[in-house]
């Protein structure tokens, strides 16, 4: 039961944790005009990984793409390349993790190869997270180091009699977005990681067998995965399985031929 | 059609107050920030104040700064300038203009109330 | 705040001649984000409040005829008319739309002769 759970929720926290990457990834709002101490312009900058957009006084918006791929630097490249990695592991992850879910049968999956599904799919939301917290921190990187750049610009005299209006970047919502998004496919998929050490069989997979206890009218009987939440009669917590490859749903509980002397 | 309608203007003595109003039609105001230009006798243009249309921003120039104040009733459809500590060179036509869609424009120009400050 | 310089500050033209005229500002009004210069021209005519001309330095407005036209970028603008007519004859303001508080040119006065 503790094991289902752990892997439900790993698979939803992965989950809403993917769509947060994916729509940090699409946001515009990367880098938004800092308004703090600047002087102040009747229009609104932010920009994005795809587009850079400005808001004027009235609420119009434009957005313009960067319909360049060498002008572009470098640190942005790799920044949309992690994202994109982020999403296409995270994507990959949430396809093998519906198959590895405890409470969806298919066919006659080995509850092993649940196991090594449920460990592969933790693995690939880990460095799902991963790439999407290092692209966000890149960013932010790149922003705080061009901040102090462009103040240091404003306050140190200019060449010519003419003035340029220093547009600053500061940290825009999709900065929290991918932390936050990142941060949760990581936990999801240590949870995933933590349910594939329930799942997996720890020892060689043996026949059950019904012992006859004297004086006693009690039968050890195959108990399953109930072995390892405290319903079997398991008491050293390890696995027994009945050699079949049947779901925990299939395990039987009632009474049957082999359960009275 | 488009419309602003100024009023308030009269002859204020210095340091005295006065309230200008804008009476607008024709479109929708609460979607529209809104702006206050003046026009002394035989001089430029002179913009005054801004009020965007949700009025969370509201900005003066520095010769009016702390003596006039811009405000908006929505649902009236009117746009206000209070205007205290009134001085000579306070003395033009003020004009009530739309702030245009595209491009940061003044769009629609009312025409205008004549203000004379004088002892 | 930005100044805004118009030259000359009169103009004697006559009927079908091309004009142009001048507004340089103190401060850039290029906006790198959308490529847009935040410049607008108005004319007024004696005894009417102005009508909005151009924005975005070069987009001539609804309704404005097409023998205005407006060019520039950063800090140097003009405003173009190709022929001038006796309608035209008014005072031209070019305005700094980009940074609080918005600021007027003196204007340009376009006379016939």
């Known amino acids: 039961m503790a094991v289902t759970a752990c892997q439900g929720l790993g698979f939803v926290v992965s989950l809403i944790g993917i769509a947060g990457i994916i729509a940090a990834t699409c946001m515009d709002q990367w880098s938004t005009q800092d308004l703090y101490n600047n002087p102040v312009t009747a229009v609104f900058n932010y920009q994005g990984l795809w587009r850079s957009c400005v808001r004027e006084s009235s609420g119009f918006t434009e957005c313009r793409g960067y319909f360049t791929l060498l002008g572009l630097p470098a640190m942005l490249q790799a920044v949309r390349a992690l994202m994109i990695v982020g999403i296409v592991l995270g994507a990959i992850g949430l396809l093998v993790s519906i198959f590895a879910l405890k409470c969806i049968r298919i066919g006659s999956m080995e509850d092993s190869a649940k196991a090594n599904m449920t460990l592969t799919s933790g693995i690939m939301f880990i460095v799902s997270g991963l790439c999407a917290i290092a692209g966000v921190s890149v960013f932010a990187n790149m922003l705080v180091t061009n901040f102090w750049m462009s103040t240091a610009n404003m306050y140190t005299g200019m060449g010519g009699m003419v003035q340029t209006v220093q547009t600053r970047y500061t940290f825009g919502a999709a900065l929290f977005v991918g932390w936050v998004a990142g941060g949760l496919t990581l936990i999801g998929g240590v949870m995933m990681c933590i349910a594939c050490r329930g799942l997996a069989p720890e020892e060689t997979n043996y026949k059950a067998v019904s012992y006859h206890a004297s004086g006693h009218s009690v039968a050890y009987k195959p108990g399953g995965f109930k072995a390892s939440t405290g319903f079997g009669s398991n008491t050293k917590n390890k696995k027994i399985y009945d050699g079949g490859a049947r779901t925990e749903d299939e395990v039987q509980s009632y009474p049957s031929k082999h359960d009275y002397v | 059609v488009v419309q602003l309608v100024e009023s308030g203007g009269d002859f204020v003595q210095p340091g005295g107050s006065r309230k200008l109003s804008c009476a607008v039609s024709?479109?929708?105001?609460?979607?529209?920030?809104m702006h206050w230009v003046r026009q002394a006798p035989e001089k430029g243009l002179e913009w005054v104040a801004y009020?965007?249309?949700?009025?969370?921003?509201?900005y003066y120039a520095d010769t009016v700064k702390g003596r006039f104040t811009v405000s908006r009733d929505n649902p009236k459809n009117s746009l206000f300038l209070h205007m205290t500590s009134l001085r000579s060179e306070d003395t033009a036509m003020y004009y009530c203009?739309?702030?245009?869609?595209?491009?940061?424009?003044?769009?629609?120009w009312g025409q205008g109330t004549p203000l004379t400050v004088s002892s | 705040d930005i100044v805004m310089t118009q030259s000359p500050s009169s103009l004697t033209v006559t009927a079908g001649e091309k004009v142009t005229m001048s507004c340089k500002s103190s401060q850039s009004l290029f906006n790198s984000g959308n490529q847009r210069n935040y410049l607008t021209w108005y004319q007024q005519k004696p005894g009417q409040p102005p009508k909005l001309l151009i924005y975005w330095a070069s987009t001539r407005e609804s309704g404005v005829p097409d023998r205005f036209t407006g060019s520039g970028s950063g800090t140097g603008f003009t405003l173009t008319i190709s022929s001038v007519q006796a309608e035209d004859l008014a005072f031209y303001y070019c305005q700094n739309v980009y940074i609080y508080p918005l600021t007027f040119g003196l204007g340009t006065k376009l006379e016939l002769r």
């Open positions: 024709g479109f929708t105001f609460s979607s529209f920030g």
């Open positions: 203009v739309r702030s245009g869609y595209y491009g940061n424009s003044l769009d629609y």
């Open positions: 009020i965007s249309s949700g009025t969370t921003n509201i």
